[in-house]
């Protein structure tokens, strides 16, 4: 079992969606889980977020806000074997440029 490299960082505007993928070469039904290391808090173990979905073990975070910032790590495990872990992707949340208050839609804070 081996894992493809993941991006070192991901920048997402406030209120948008973040997609993290965990590509791996497992042909079996590997178990993908996602974990987060919080800003300035590198204690172990990290916070468990939930399972990945689809063949790439995708983690979707809708409606991103500042509190979502941190390092996102996926783990892939086949059966009872020891898991492989990604190096982690750092999520940076940026404030989008101001827009008219009434212009709210799929890609905005109320999404």
């Amino acid at each position: 079992l081996w894992m493809h490299k993941v991006p070192a960082s991901l920048m997402v505007s406030l209120g948008e969606d973040a997609h993290f993928q965990c590509p791996h070469n497992s042909s079996n039904n590997a178990n993908v889980t996602w974990w987060r290391v919080l800003h300035g808090n590198y204690t172990w173990p990290p916070e468990f977020l939930g399972p990945g979905e689809d063949p790439n073990g995708t983690l979707i975070i809708q409606n991103v806000n500042k509190s979502h910032g941190g390092i996102y790590v996926c783990r892939v495990q086949e059966g009872n074997e020891s898991y492989q872990q990604s190096c982690g992707t750092y999520l940076r949340v940026r404030q989008p440029p101001p827009r008219p208050f009434l212009d709210m839609g799929e890609g905005t804070k109320n999404r």
Epitope: D17, I60, N63, M104, G105, E106
Partner: antibody
């Protein structure tokens, strides 16, 4: 795989309340909006509202404010909708649904099997 | 709120024929980010709705290529090139550009002639 499992059919009396559950698995529950949709006889589909389990934020269709209350329990990955002061017009099938339309060519769309609510004396 | 108007209400077809359903919105569905969040669903009797097309023309995973979506701004069309028995049901368009609330069209019932 992603699953949304709703509670069973309900037969309730006018004026009463009912609470429908939507138990989820297979994704990170806290980070996706959970939507609720009404499918009434001859009424088509109506969006009731949504909840973001991570922080409890809710948005409601104005038509259902005061009628529906959305909650979520992160510990059990379950979303709930309570309908109050029920009348015959509330008789319908109610769906929980998770959808994402983002990225250039990316979509996620999962619905519960539906919960039938019948209001009758 | 954005009002979605579908036509026709009922569409009788013969198997193998082409079917076309129209959806019109009360305001443009082009979002400021350039995307158009117009989607098509099929609901069969006793089932939950199933996503067919998202963002005007993108087929959802597992949807046969006989389904296609087109349109822009306020006018959109779903086409089924060769209708099969499993395609029968009620088709809904939906918008998620101006939300909340998400809004749906009134539905078009595809039935055998």
């Amino acid at each position: 795989q992603v699953q949304l499992q709703q509670s069973g059919p309900e037969l309730v009396k006018p004026g009463a309340s009912v609470k429908i559950s939507c138990k989820t698995s297979g994704y990170a529950f806290s980070f996706s909006w959970m939507n609720w949709v009404k499918w009434g006889p001859g009424q088509g589909l109506e969006w009731i509202g949504r909840i973001y389990p991570g922080n409890g934020d809710t948005n409601y269709n104005g038509k259902f404010k005061g009628k529906a209350t959305l909650t979520a329990d992160k510990s059990s990955n379950t979303a709930y909708m309570q309908l109050s002061s029920l009348t015959s017009v509330d008789s319908a099938v109610y769906f929980c649904a998770r959808w994402v339309y983002s990225g250039n060519n990316y979509a996620v769309d999962y619905w519960g099997q539906g919960t039938s609510v019948t209001v009758s004396s | 709120d954005v009002v979605m108007t579908q036509t026709p209400l009922s569409l009788p077809v013969s198997l193998g024929d082409q079917a076309s359903i129209s959806c019109r919105s009360s305001q443009s569905l082009v979002h400021s980010n350039g995307n158009t969040y117009l989607h098509w669903y099929l609901q069969k009797p006793g089932q939950s709705p199933k996503l067919l097309i998202y963002k005007v023309s993108n087929r959802f995973s597992g949807v046969p290529d006989r389904f296609s979506g087109s349109g822009s701004g306020t006018d959109f069309t779903l086409k089924i090139s060769r209708v099969e028995a499993e395609d029968l049901g009620v088709y809904f368009c939906s918008q998620s550009t101006h939300v909340p609330p998400y809004t749906f069209g009134g539905g078009t019932k595809l039935e055998i002639k």
